[in-house]
């Protein structure tokens, strides 16, 4: 059964068959033998009942308030009362575009990943047993699918599935005929899945430095939106009032990942800076990496193997 | 109301090579379609010559062209190509385009819903 209205605020195009449908139908029992009342209130009127004898583009049955179909002068707020039971809906009905086969207002948006699943399916459970046939537009152009009452895409997604698709109901009742759009907006994006972050250069640098001079090292990430980057160094950090953390950069990359930079900048550098570990570390759910610094007079660099210096 | 609109055939000799085109007609798209080519000869009956499926990826072709025959698509440019070399006698006759009855390109493809007027091909010298 098709679920009931629970949403207090619907915006819907006119022209269209529409309907209410009240969320305490379950209690089948009560509704056959109590007084069921349907109001609407708008501008000027205050509470108005409905009934069939009220407009013939409205039908009343059990649980539902059906518009066949609904126009620009039916927004307004409607009631359902029962017993001491009430729900309350607004309705703003909005102009159909009559120069799209959709209005831009009623459109779902959705992310598909590029490669991942990608479906559309068009189906409308209340107006099922009427529907004669169902189109699937991309972009406004038809596409010629061979099921007709249920037409359906399943693929995996390339960037070019992206676009609009209207799913378009045609309906029997009464002798007339009437359609109903639902319109997707599909945005194709890159892979979103996790990365192993990587620290970028070398695991171990060498940086030869002058005493009493100013470094600045670098340290460079490949992440994802979530991992965090940072340095570890001394006994305890922030011990030292001549080094500095800068501020974290942040660059994200085409494919959807952050390119990372976190400066440590040592100023007045002292014999204590020499020769002791400078760490940076990325850290993920999928784990760390690091890498090291070490200062070294320049009077030794001579000492080191060259492959190893960073300058 | 035409969908579907050949083109491409005409009078060429044994041994010769054509190109068909299956493109969609203004306001729809062929890029979810699985498509078929088919051909009817006089007195004949219609015979499934090759199919290709939406993605490009699944293609078909009848025993009497494997070989000379090649079937693409531009979904782009909303069209399906039949590449013909190595043409016979035999393979004079209307050819035309259509979707696929049962959403699926196979050695039992079956016409669907959809379909072109066709596009005359003889073979002849």
């Known amino acids: 059964a098709e679920s009931c209205t629970s949403r207090p605020h619907i915006t819907v195009v006119e022209g269209e068959p529409f309907y209410l449908k009240h969320c305490s139908c379950s209690l089948a029992h009560e509704i056959e033998t109590t007084t069921k009342s349907w109001y609407k209130s708008s501008g000027s009127q205050e509470h108005v009942e409905l009934n069939p004898r009220s407009s013939s583009r409205i039908a009343l049955h059990d649980c539902v308030l059906e518009f066949w179909p609904v126009e620009l002068n039916d927004t307004g707020s409607y009631f359902f009362q029962m017993k001491n039971y009430t729900q309350k809906w607004k309705l703003n009905v909005i102009r159909r575009n009559k120069h799209s086969c959709f209005t831009e207002r009623q459109v779902t948006s959705k992310i598909v990943e590029v490669k991942k699943f990608f479906q559309i399916t068009c189906e409308n459970s209340y107006y099922q047993t009427l529907v004669n046939s169902t189109s699937l537009y991309k972009n406004c152009k038809k596409l010629l699918l061979e099921n007709n009452k249920n037409p359906t895409i399943k693929k995996n997604a390339e960037f070019e599935d992206q676009g609009y698709y209207s799913c378009v109901h045609f309906l029997h009742h009464n002798g007339k005929l009437f359609n109903i759009t639902k319109t997707f907006n599909i945005t194709i994006v890159e892979d979103r899945s996790n990365i192993v972050p990587v620290l970028l250069g070398p695991k171990l640098n060498h940086v030869a430095v002058e005493l009493g001079k100013n470094v600045r090292l670098n340290c460079s990430a490949l992440l994802n939106e979530e991992d965090v980057i940072y340095w570890m160094f001394g006994e305890e950090n922030g011990s030292d009032p001549n080094i500095h953390e800068e501020k974290e950069m942040r660059i994200m990359t085409p494919e959807g990942k952050w390119h990372a930079s976190k400066v440590l900048r040592i100023e007045n550098i002292g014999e204590s800076n020499l020769n002791v570990l400078y760490n940076c570390t990325v850290a993920s759910t999928g784990g760390t990496d690091t890498k090291s610094f070490i200062l070294v007079r320049k009077a030794d660099m001579a000492d080191i193997p060259g492959h190893v210096f960073t300058r | 109301e035409v969908q579907l609109v050949e083109s491409g055939g005409g009078l060429v000799q044994p041994g010769g090579s054509l190109r068909l085109s299956c493109a969609a007609a203004?306001?729809?798209?062929?890029?979810?379609?699985?498509i078929g080519w088919f051909r009817q000869a006089p007195g004949k009956a219609r015979e499934g010559v090759s199919c290709i499926s939406s993605s490009g990826e699944v293609a078909y072709y009848a025993g009497s062209v494997k070989g000379r025959f090649t079937i693409s698509r531009d979904n782009a440019k909303n069209t399906v190509y039949l590449q013909m070399n190595s043409l016979k006698p035999e393979d004079t006759a209307v050819y035309y385009c259509?979707?696929?009855?049962?959403?699926?390109?196979?050695?039992?493809?079956?016409?669907?819903?959809?379909r072109g007027q066709g596009t005359q091909v003889t073979v002849s010298s």
């Open positions: 203004s306001g729809f798209t062929l890029v979810y379609s699985n």
């Open positions: 259509a979707t696929l009855q049962g959403d699926v390109c196979t050695n039992t493809f079956m016409s669907g819903s959809y």
